[in-house]
Amino acid sequence: VPRWRQQWSGPGTTKRFPETVLARCVKYTEIHPEMRHVDCQSVWDAFKGAFISKHPCNITEEDYQPLMKLGTQTVPCNKILLWSRIKDLAHQFTQVQRDMFTLEDTLLGYLADDLTWCGEFNTSKINYQSCPDWRKDCSNNPVSVFWKTVSRRFAEAACDVVHVMLNGSRSKIFDKNSTFGSVEVHNLQPEKVQTLEAWVIHGGREDSRDLCQDPTIKELESIISKRNIQFSCKNIYRPDKFLQCVKNPEDSSCTSEI
């Protein structure tokens, strides 16, 4: 008789999840000499241990602590780029500006980027059929708790000027409910961070509005200022040109507004 299985509202675990995590770990540790000491089998065991045999709505940050310990990594605290709803451009930027880091440029972020996973209470099986949706099912699911945990730690590590890329095409350029708005903003350490510098990325070719005056950006400024961190904002009108100028600042077109 087939065992009854909980049906969740979200997509199931990414196919070949264990193999993908292990392969990514091996690749990352080969490319990054400072992480060569990491034992990828132990990393996978710790990752698996965080959610296997546990109810996928009862995951805690504590469940991920063994993985966090194994994935401990020092990134230059003044070279951190946060992002909200504009991941691709943020990643393109750090691919060019190699000394800056998004969360997904760290081992743990790289392992989990774009993946979904969950288990089932009291069985050692991975659920490939469905996983809890943050809104429709529960917020304490394996994926959400993982990203909340690593995002908090990443923000806590930041110092000096912290940069954040925001999507100017969204109705809420700054969204209090995003990971940036709900986790990272509140875990920047005022004794280490002098300034949060927002880059608002424009979508339309002819959009010359100053989106730094947007009400949601003013809300972000207010939250940051109350935390005794300075705030600054810059429009990036031409993201394509911006990336080109990061690659080659000598280019004559880089003298005008980007």
Epitope: N78, D99, D160, V161, H163, T195, E197, K234, V246, P249
Partner: nanobody, 122 residues
Amino acid sequence: QVKLQESGGRLVQPGGSLRLSCAASGRTLSNYAMAWFRQGPGKEREFVASISASDSTLYADFVKGRFTISRDNAKNTVYLQMDSLKPEDTTVYYCAARFWIGVRAPAEYNYWGQGTQVTVSS
């Protein structure tokens, strides 16, 4: 190519004020982070302050509350307002530029001025 020229350095009494200027030619500064460093004889170049393309500022602990960095993109000039000067602020001050982001490490700046001497003495 960016050319930077510092000015404003002179002899000033302890507790006095001074404003250093750094004028850029060759291209507009609006997309550039600008910084001030200082270096005494036989010493490492030391970060003082920076201002990014988006005007966010960063200061060394030893100048916080005493020095202020600012920029005027229309004049293509960056300033360092130095207040409550101390004898230990005596040295040569350099202006530097790099694309977009201000950082503390001198090695990350592509363009440098020739420097201006500041002497704090009674």
